[in-house]
C-alpha cells in the first residue's frame, strides 16, 4: 500500500501505528485496537475506526465531546467485533453477554438479546441519507454550486465513486446528501458508502480522521459552509427486526426501515 514513505504515516487514518517493517522495508500501518493492517491509499473501514477509537485511553480520547453520548440507546459508540476484512460482524455482544444484530454500518437493527441471539448475515445498508442544517451565512448558497461542491468533496476527499452520490437536496438551511450503493453495484476497490459517510460525519464534527490535515474547509464559491446539526438515516436492504413496542414507542425510528444517529453541533 502507499503509506507515506518519508515519515511512514497513514494519510487516510491517524488512528494507526506505522513502521517500515513491510515487505522490502516498506511502511506498514496497523489500526489501533485491532492491530489489523490497513490500506492507506483508501478509507479505513468504520468497524476498525470504531475499534481504534474505543481502544484509546479514556484520558487520551481528546476527540470525544459530550454530544457523542446523545446517540439513541448510546449505540453509536461501542467496541465492535470486526471480521478479517475489517467489516462489522453481524452479531455484536458486550461484556455482559448482551447481544444484538447490526447492519453493514454497525448500527443496531434488532432488539437486544442474549448469547443465543442469531444474526444469520450482515445486512447491507444500501441507502444513507445525511441531513445537515447549515449555519446562517452572509451569502446565500446556489443549489447547483452546492451540489457540485459536495459531489467534489465525496469524490476527492473520500474517494467515493460519483455514481454512489445519488442526490443533493437543498432547502435553506437544510442540505440532504443521498448515498446509494447496492451489493451488486459495489465493485472490488470501491469505497463503501458507510465508510464515506462515517469519515464525513467525523469531518463535520471537527474530528477529522485524516492524518495531519486541518479541519474540513467546505466552500461554495468561496462562501464557507458551517454545519450546525447532523442527522444520519440508514436504510437497509432487508428491513430491521424491532419489536412493535420500539416501532411505536417513539424510540429512535424515523420509520421502521430507518435507523438514525442524532448528533448536535454547537
Amino acid at each position: 500500500h502507499t503509506a507515506a514513505q518519508d515519515n511512514c504515516t497513514c494519510p487516510t487514518n491517524k488512528m494507526t501505528v506505522c513502521s517500515p517493517d513491510g515487505p522490502g522495508g516498506r511502511c506498514q500501518c496497523r489500526a489501533l485496537g485491532s492491530g489489523m493492517a490497513v490500506d492507506c491509499s483508501t478509507l479505513t473501514s468504520k468497524c476498525l475506526l470504531l475499534k481504534a477509537r474505543m481502544s484509546a485511553p479514556k484520558n487520551a480520547r481528546t476527540l470525544v465531546r459530550p454530544s457523542e453520548h446523545a446517540l439513541v440507546d448510546n449505540d453509536g459508540l461501542y467496541d465492535p467485533d470486526c471480521d478479517p476484512e475489517g467489516r462489522f460482524k453481524a452479531r455484536q455482544c458486550n461484556q455482559t453477554s448482551v447481544c444484538w444484530c447490526v447492519n453493514s454500518v454497525g448500527v443496531r437493527r434488532t432488539d437486544k438479546g442474549d448469547l443465543s441471539l442469531r444474526c444469520d448475515e450482515l445486512v447491507r445498508t444500501h441507502h444513507i441519507l445525511i441531513d445537515l442544517r447549515h449555519r446562517p451565512t452572509a451569502g446565500a448558497f446556489n443549489h447547483s454550486d452546492l451540489d457540485a461542491e459536495l459531489r467534489r468533496l465525496f469524490r476527492e476527499r473520500y474517494r467515493l465513486h460519483p455514481k454512489f452520490v445519488a442526490a443533493v437536496h437543498y432547502e435553506q438551511p437544510t442540505i440532504q446528501i443521498e448515498l446509494r450503493q447496492n451489493t451488486s453495484q459495489k465493485a472490488a476497490g470501491d469505497v463503501d458508502i458507510g465508510d464515506a459517510a462515517y469519515y464525513f460525519e467525523r469531518d463535520i464534527k471537527g474530528e477529522s480522521l485524516f492524518q495531519g490535515r486541518g479541519g474540513l474547509d467546505l466552500r461554495v464559491r468561496g462562501e464557507p459552509l458551517q454545519v450546525e446539526r447532523t442527522l444520519i438515516y440508514y436504510l437497509d436492504e432487508i428491513p430491521p427486526k424491532f419489536s412493535m413496542k420500539r416501532l411505536t414507542g417513539g424510540g429512535s425510528g424515523g420509520g421502521s426501515h430507518h435507523h438514525h444517529h442524532h448528533h448536535h453541533h454547537h
Partner: antibody, heavy 122, light 106 residues
Framework: QVQLVQSGAEVKKPGASVKVSCKAS????????INWVRQRPGQGLEWMGW????????KYNEKFKGRVTMTVDTSTSTVYMELSSLRSEDTAVYYC???????????????WGQGTLVTVSS | EIVLTQSPATLSLSPGERATLSCSAS?????IYWYQRKPGQAPRLLIY???NLASGIPARFSGSGSGTDYTLTISSLEPEDFAVYYC?????????FGQGTKVEIK
C-alpha cells in the same frame, strides 16, 4: 507562523489607481480567504471585500464595486487589492486579513497584515 | 446593512478593574467577533463566534450575547489592555464593524 506582509506606503493623486499587495506565509495559501479592510483617519474599520485563492471567488462591498479589484497570484502566495478613481476620502490605512473557516466554525479575521498607508493628495 | 453600535464610546478605568463593552446590532445576528487595536498596530482578533477565545488570548477576555446584544468583558484590566475594541458581524453583506470603544486609563 501565519503571517501577512503588505507592500509599502503610497502617495497618489486624485483620479489615479493604487495597487496594494499582501504576501501570505505559514499556512496553505489556497485554504483561506483574504479580506481587505481600511481605516480612514479618525474613523472606524470598513470592510472592502474578500477573495478566495483556491478558485478566485470574490465578494466586494457594494460601496466599492466598480472601483475595487482583488486578484491573486498563487505562485507567490500574494493577493492584490487595486482601488481606482482615487479621491481624498480614500486616504486610509489598508489592511489585508486572513479569514480561516472550517465546517465547524468561522474563526474570524486573524492575522492581519501590518497595514499600508495610502495618501491621496493633489 | 447591519449597523453595529458600541457603547460606551470611551471607558475610563484603572488597572485591575472590570471592563464591560457593549455591541448592539440594528438587526439580529448569529455571532459577533471582537478585535483589539492599539495605536500604530494592526487589529488583533480576541473573540470569534461570540464567546470563543482566539489563540493566544488571555482568559481574562470573554464574550457573550445573542440576537442584537453582545458583550465583551475584561475581568481584570492589565496595562496592555488599554486600547480600542471593535465588534464585527458576519451575518450579512456588507460585513460591518462597530465604531469602537476606547478603553483608557483613568
Amino acid at each position: 507562523q501565519v503571517q501577512l506582509v503588505q507592500s509599502g506606503a503610497e502617495v497618489k493623486k486624485p483620479g489615479a489607481s493604487v495597487k496594494v499587495s499582501c504576501k501570505a506565509s505559514g499556512y496553505t495559501f489556497t485554504s483561506s480567504d483574504i479580506n481587505w479592510v481600511r481605516q480612514r483617519p479618525g474613523q472606524g474599520l470598513e470592510w472592502m471585500g474578500w477573495i478566495y485563492p483556491r478558485d478566485g471567488s470574490k465578494k466586494y462591498n457594494e460601496k466599492f464595486k466598480g472601483r475595487v479589484t482583488m486578484t491573486v497570484d498563487t505562485s507567490t502566495s500574494t493577493v492584490y487589492m487595486e482601488l481606482s478613481s482615487l479621491r481624498s476620502e480614500d486616504t486610509a490605512v489598508y489592511y489585508c486579513a486572513r479569514r480561516f473557516a472550517t465546517v465547524v466554525s468561522n474563526y474570524g479575521l486573524d492575522p492581519w497584515g501590518q497595514g499600508t498607508l495610502v495618501t491621496v493628495s493633489s | 446593512e447591519i449597523v453595529l453600535t458600541q457603547s460606551p464610546a470611551t471607558l475610563s478605568l484603572s488597572p485591575g478593574e472590570r471592563a464591560t463593552l457593549s455591541c448592539s446590532a440594528s438587526s439580529s445576528v448569529n455571532y459577533i467577533y471582537w478585535y483589539q487595536r492599539k495605536p500604530g498596530q494592526a487589529p488583533r482578533l480576541l473573540i470569534y463566534d461570540t464567546s470563543n477565545l482566539a489563540s493566544g488570548i488571555p482568559a481574562r477576555f470573554s464574550g457573550s450575547g445573542s440576537g442584537t446584544d453582545y458583550t465583551l468583558t475584561i475581568s481584570s484590566l492589565e496595562p496592555e489592555d488599554f486600547a480600542v475594541y471593535y465588534c464585527q458581524q458576519w451575518n450579512s453583506y456588507p460585513l460591518t464593524f462597530g465604531q469602537g470603544t476606547k478603553v483608557e486609563i483613568k
